[in-house]
């Protein structure tokens, strides 16, 4: 007994395409050995017609695959457009040599059935309308016309010019002639469903005058197509129902035994346990759109299955396309943390993985929205403005080379709860979803800015400090100066590092920035962070408000700004923070079902990019004390 | 929903026929997977693999069988009839037992018994020496 598993028959007719899935038992040995697909000959040989290696025979050219899952411990053999050829005994196996482990398997190609002579073959998919054309001779132009269906040797009525419609026919077929054709008449069946196959024979007239024609109906059900993914990964469905559909709901779901479960559809239904991962995107008016998923689980395989109806609902009779989706668990997407917490007032620094071949790639970050069909405005990128209402406490922290870039936000509030997307124009599997919860503080935060009413002046001398505790004593401090291309590391001063660990003084321990002399673009957002090497900490952001010695220009309270920063991130208190309109990042949600068009994200951002490890930023006058 | 029967058990001498029909009636019947499982007496809730039968449309078909049936099992299907059958020949003591016939959209590996949706109520098939 062999532990390769197959189907032992495979028949099927010429022009047809088969797809041949061998199991194989599950071992580290099995999953990663070739695989091959050979015919045996009558002298015992079996001879190579495609593996794992890459061999392909002439034979097979251009119209075979072999595909391993190992995930799943099977490969598929696909072979297109058989002939009576292809008829034989072959082998699916697995080993160096086609004499390991292998199932027999005998496959039988037909030719297309013969029909009555003027038989008419109609081939279309489930949901789909057919219209059999029914020619008939002048002399019954005037006679009953029907459409019948062959049941062994009788033939059951469908529909005849009578008005009579089988009640399984009922409002999906209709009898019609086109125009002033007096010799055609016309059969329509809709919402096909996979027991309307069969012959069909229509026809003009009575008794031995009769007109008849011959029609064999195909209703092909969707071969689901094998999509293989990562765990943490995307996948996009890509579904195109046809334009017939196109006014319909359309809906994504999930095989589930008897039924198919809703995920997500467009009037707004979506199963919880997909929230903060999904997007559906309409493509064009023809009805297609896309559904990408982020975050894969384990738990995600199955099999998928999109549509359309006007109830959003799976049904039958209407158009479906399928899929078939394997998760592998041997990820090259590194785990990263799926929920961070926070609290308001407080910051985040939230860590996002990308394909390290891929360093120079773009990156961004983004919100999703369980609105409509879900989608996810960007908020920041390397090369993307930060999004209004986050001026001053979002930041990306690109570092090359190391696979990661790091989002900062900070001056938290309950309201920046929710799920947020790390995405870049590369690679699309490398899309990873965090959840981020935003609890009331209960205590101070860790770190605290000193003077809290920052107004310099301008020409003169101003410091600002940073108080931080003991327990960030071992950990790099850093002011930055934010920007809408990042927060660039300013020169500072630590006063505390002078101390013993052992003796720090909660009080004392301070890291201070000057601005010597002041000047006018001084003005803006400046952040107190701790960092370890590449992994970033907490932060504290204080806006500083810059004024001339007369004091004759009237400026905003430079309080109103802060309190910003410690109660209300989400209003916009800064004039000066504002920019023309014409530099905002204008970036459309949609790009994110799509890595194909994710590279437009930048085209009309800046073009510097952000760097976490840049000196003082350009006009700055900030020195060590 | 989809309602599978089964008929064509009994009793029969060792080495003797039966064939097998499972209908499908109720909402109209769109599996393209369909296989057959036994429980030996004794083996609950244990329901072994016989035989499977997909399609892909109506014209290209992919069967498989266990290693104790192969040779002696067939599995076919009639579309018109939404029917499909197992005919046994060669029986023996061993495949007395209550034969199961089993539906579904898809499987992953037909003989796996999760893979599939919709379940008969089972007919005995007893094979006597």
């Known amino acids: 007994q062999s532990p390769i598993f197959g189907p032992q028959d495979v028949s099927s007719i010429e022009g047809n395409s088969v797809s041949i899935t061998c199991y194989y038992p599950d071992t580290s040995v099995n999953r990663h050995t070739r695989k091959y697909w050979c015919r045996q000959g009558a002298n015992g040989y079996c001879a190579t017609l495609i593996s794992s290696n890459g061999y392909l025979s002439k034979e097979y050219s251009g119209r075979a695959s072999l595909i391993n899952f190992p995930e799943n411990s099977t490969f598929v053999i696909n072979i297109a457009h058989l002939t009576q050829e292809d008829t034989g005994s072959y082998k699916c196996g697995l080993g160096t040599t086609n004499r390991g482990l292998f199932f027999d398997v005998s496959l039988e190609v037909s030719q297309v059935p013969e029909f009555p002579n003027d038989t008419h073959v109609y081939t279309k998919d489930i949901g789909r309308t057919v219209t059999i054309e029914c020619r008939f001779k002048e002399g019954n132009a005037h006679s009953k016309k029907s459409l019948c269906k062959k049941r062994g040797e009788a033939c059951e009525v469908v529909i005849d010019s009578t008005e009579y419609v089988d009640p399984s026919y009922k409002d999906r077929a209709i009898l019609f002639m086109k125009g002033t054709s007096r010799d055609i008449f016309y059969v329509n069946i809709s919402h096909l469903i996979p027991s309307d196959a069969g012959l069909y024979v229509c026809q003009a007239g009575e008794g031995p005058s009769a007109d008849k024609n011959n029609a064999d109906l195909q209703v092909l059900e969707p071969e689901p197509e094998l999509l293989y993914k990562d765990l943490r990964s995307s996948v996009t469905f890509e579904c195109d129902l046809g334009r017939e559909v196109a006014n319909d709901a359309k809906y994504l779901c999930r095989k589930n035994k008897e039924t198919c479960d809703v995920i997500i559809n467009t009037l707004g239904k979506r199963d919880p346990a997909f929230e903060g991962r999904i997007l559906l995107t309409p493509r064009d008016d023809n009805g297609r759109f896309s559904v990408l998923i982020t975050g894969l689980r384990k738990e995600d395989a199955g099999h998928y299955q999109c549509g359309a109806h006007s109830s959003g609902l799976p049904q039958e009779g209407w158009p479906v396309q399928a899929w078939q989706l394997f998760v592998n668990e041997e990820s090259t997407i590194p785990n990263s943390r799926s929920v961070v917490k926070g609290v308001t007032g407080g910051s985040v620094a939230i860590v996002c993985p990308y394909n390290p071949k891929e360093s120079s790639s773009l990156k961004y970050w983004c919100h999703w929205e369980a609105d409509e069909n879900g989608r996810c405005p960007v908020l920041v990128g390397t090369q993307a403005l930060v999004q209004e209402g986050y001026e001053g406490r979002l930041a990306l922290f690109d570092q090359p080379g190391s696979g990661a870039y790091t989002v900062i936000l900070n001056q938290l509030t309950t309201q920046d709860s929710g799920f947020y997307w790390c995405l870049t124009d590369g690679d699309s599997r490398w899309r990873t979803t965090i959840e981020l919860q935003v609890a009331e503080a209960t205590k101070k935060p860790d770190l605290e800015v000193t003077p809290q009413n920052a107004t310099a002046v301008i020409g003169e001398t101003f410091t600002i400090s940073c108080h931080y505790p003991c327990k960030f004593y071992s950990q790099e401090k850093y002011w930055c100066k934010w920007s809408n291309d990042g927060c660039h590391i300013l020169p500072s001063h630590d006063e505390g590092a002078r101390q013993s660990s052992v003796s720090c003084d909660q009080s004392s321990q301070i890291v201070s920035m000057t601005l010597n002399p002041v000047k006018k673009e001084d003005e803006g957002w400046y952040w107190c962070g701790v960092k370890e090497g590449q992994v970033y900490g907490e932060t504290t952001a204080i806006y500083v408000a810059v004024e001339e010695r007369t004091r004759g220009s009237p400026h905003i309270n430079p309080t109103d700004a802060n309190a910003r920063a410690k109660d209300a991130p989400e209003e916009e208190a800064m004039e000066s923070s504002v920019r023309e309109d014409e530099n905002k990042a204008n970036l459309d949600p949609r790009l994110f079902a799509d890595e194909r068009e994710i590279q437009n994200a930048g085209d009309q951002a800046q073009e510097n990019r952000a760097s976490g490890n840049a000196g003082s930023a350009g006009g700055q006058s900030g020195s060590s004390k | 929903e989809v309602q599978l029967v089964e008929s064509g058990g009994g009793l029969v001498q060792t080495g003797g026929s039966l064939r097998l029909s499972c209908a499908a009636s109720?909402?109209?019947?769109?599996?393209?997977?369909m296989g057959w499982f036994r429980q030996a007496p004794g083996k609950e809730p244990e329901r072994d693999f016989v035989a499977a039968l997909r399609w892909s449309n109506d014209r290209t078909y992919y069967k498989y069988y266990a290693d104790s049936v192969k040779g002696r099992f067939t599995i076919s299907r009639d579309n018109a009839k939404n029917t499909v059958y197992l005919q046994m020949n060669t029986l023996k003591p061993e495949d007395t037992a209550v034969y199961y016939c089993a539906g579904g959209n898809y499987f992953s590996d037909p003989r796996v018994d999760k893979e599939y949706n919709y379940w008969g109520q089972g007919t005995q098939v007893t094979v006597s020496s």
């Open positions: 109720g909402r109209t019947f769109s599996s393209y997977a």
